[in-house]
């Protein structure tokens, strides 16, 4: 006998042919005998079957011999053999129906994790497949289990129900909820205005929650608060904010935070943290802030950064259109009796420039 | 609730092949019928073809040397094209859902060949 | 191809007025019959089905019969937005077909 897979909620259609082209009676039975729809005369007449409302069959294929039968909004309970009865035969197809749910919101916070559950018709032994949009391969059988969800989990995950040689394929579309970046470094010249952006990897219709940006600055001893914040259906306003620094934020997402002036004792890094309305756990964001100054002391010019760098970052004095440069893998460069000219102030990373701040050397007479 | 969005060339030049897709959404796609009709001042609505998920299709015999209607279940779509086109096709081209009835519609394309 | 025909072509009518559009198949096509409404710039919409069956979200002043070759569609109570053209449409064979429609016009 013929096995037809079937979906949840879909529509599928079991089909039956004649071997004459031509326009002959029909019928439609479940394993009970009990009739679902048939032909009397020109007219589709449908039986007593709980599945009767839901059963239908496509008159223009008639005259090409095919009495297929059409069921709307699957159910589980639907599964069962069918027996189209046409021509004095008999054709049996067994209809299997299964369903693919995720046990929670689909809106789930990143670290957090996913199960997904089949639906299936007693006696069945399904296995299921799941490929996530990143290409991760998950198997399992009823249930499906994802321990902790990564921001490329987001999208449409394909599920394929395996039975009796059959497939059938699911799509269940997950939203990770997490800033797009886990973590973002801004370079600034001391006094320049620092721009920190936020942008989330998702969108919702409504987004409601609040958040709190903590920040540690390298010269202090403990983390302080900088700002406290609202979000209303994707509109922000700010609750709290500190004196020093006092920070700007933007009223419209992507969240958005202005530090007026990059001094070294702002240099440090930061956690933005949002509590989304209805979920638990909440979004971070790292955020970390390297500031350069260059300055003339007397006899002394002195290239100095703050903040969170690595140890491989190049710190360099060089004198413009001349070879003299001085390079250190530290936090602080100089040049005694320096040459007049324009000076340059280069943070590097393996030759590309992060950071650049010029200074004037002006003759001593 | 099942939506179909349509989309393709609007103006052709008489001899071109007309192309439309329409992708279905937020519905079955399997145990369905997917049709193209298209509507003109001259000639009201007429049918031209259908497709299901397997493939198989049905023509308007008036249009069959002319029309392929293709099916890709991996996007939930289907398409029309319409060879050697000529000014008698402009009309507004309707991708349906179909078993028995047209249930769903798409937006309308106004598709115009002219030289 | 099983030939539609509908009568009138248009109509006009007030609202409150009890309006019947009939159809016509060129051969018998049993109850294989529905109707559609269609506004301006818009695509049809499916009102009846089965000759008599109402989709759902039809209001009931809707209402269909005939069997054979001979269909009506009928509005009890003609209300502002009812006033479009309606199409009947044959599902007995391939080509499906329309009729020519029937324009609703307020007088």
């Known amino acids: 006998k013929k096995v037809v897979l079937g979906k949840k909620g879909d529509t599928v259609e079991l089909t039956c042919n004649a071997s004459q082209k031509k326009n002959t009676q029909f019928h439609w039975k479940n394993s009970n005998q009990i009739k679902i729809l048939g032909i009397q005369g020109l007219f589709l007449t449908k039986g007593p079957s709980k599945l009767s409302d839901r059963a239908d069959s496509r008159k223009s294929l008639w005259d090409q011999g095919c009495f297929s039968m059409i069921i709307k909004n699957l159910k589980i309970e639907d599964s069962d053999t069918y027996i189209c009865e046409v021509e004095n035969k008999k054709e049996e197809v067994e209809l299997l129906v299964f369903g693919l749910t995720a046990n929670s919101d689909t809106h789930l916070l990143e670290g957090q994790s996913l199960t997904l559950t089949l639906e299936s018709p007693p006696g069945s032994s399904p296995s299921v497949k799941c490929r996530s949009p990143g290409g991760k391969n998950i198997q399992g059988g009823r249930t499906i289990s994802v321990p902790q969800l990564e921001r490329q989990d987001s999208g449409t995950w394909t599920c394929t129900v395996s039975q009796d040689q059959k497939t059938v394929e699911f799509k269940i579309d997950i939203v990770v909820l997490a800033f797009q970046k886990a973590s973002s470094t801004v370079y600034k010249k001391e006094g320049e205005q620092v721009e920190f952006s936020f942008p989330l990897a998702f969108t919702l219709e409504k987004l409601t929650g609040s958040g709190e940006l903590w920040w540690q600055a390298e010269r202090a001893s403990s983390s302080k608060s900088w700002i406290t914040f609202d979000l209303k259906n994707k509109e922000v306003s700010v609750k709290r904010v500190t004196q020093d620094p006092k920070l700007q934020m933007g009223k419209k997402l992507p969240l958005h935070l202005t530090l007026p002036q990059a001094l070294p004792q702002y240099a440090g890094s930061g956690n933005l943290t949002l509590a989304l309305e209805a979920k638990t756990g909440k979004l971070h964001q790292e955020v970390n802030l390297v500031v350069m100054r260059a300055t003339q002391f007397q006899e002394n010019l002195t290239c100095e950064v703050w903040g969170p760098t690595s140890p491989k970052l190049t710190l360099s004095l060089k004198l413009e259109n001349k070879g003299a440069t001085v390079s250190k893998q530290a936090k602080a460069v100089w040049v005694l009796n320096p040459e007049a000219g324009m000076w340059q102030c280069l943070l590097s990373d393996s030759g590309q420039v992060l950071l650049e701040s010029n200074i004037k050397v002006v003759p001593t007479w | 609730q099942v939506q179909l969005q349509q989309w393709g060339a609007g103006l052709l030049k008489p001899s071109e092949t007309l192309s439309l897709t329409c992708a279905v959404y937020?519905?079955?796609?399997?145990?369905?019928?997917w049709s193209w009709i298209r509507q003109s001042p001259g000639k009201g609505l007429e049918w031209i073809g259908e497709i299901n998920q397997s493939g198989s299709t049905n023509y308007n015999p008036s249009l069959k040397s002319r029309v392929t209607i293709s099916v890709d279940t991996s996007k939930d779509q289907f398409s029309l094209k319409l060879s050697s086109v000529t000014a008698a096709d402009t009309a507004v081209y309707y991708c349906?859902?179909?078993?028995?009835?047209?249930?769903?519609w798409g937006q309308g394309s106004l598709v115009t060949v002219s030289s | 191809d099983i030939q539609m025909t509908q009568s009138p072509s248009s109509v006009s009518a007030s609202v409150g007025d009890r309006v019947t559009i009939t159809c016509r198949a060129s051969?018998?096509?049993?109850?294989?019959l529905a109707w559609y409404q269609q506004k301006p710039g818009k695509a049809p919409k499916l009102l009846i089905y089965d000759a008599s069956s109402f989709q759902s979200g039809v209001p009931s002043r809707f209402s269909g019969s005939g069997s054979g070759t001979d269909f009506t569609l009928t509005i009890s109570s003609l209300q502002t937005d009812d006033f479009a053209t309606y199409y009947c449409q044959q599902a007995n064979s391939f080509p499906y077909t329309f009729g020519q429609g029937t324009k609703l016009e307020i007088k």
């Open positions: 937020g519905g079955s796609f399997s145990g369905y019928y």
């Open positions: 051969q018998g096509i049993s109850s294989w």
């Open positions: 349906a859902r179909v078993i028995n009835w047209f249930d769903s």
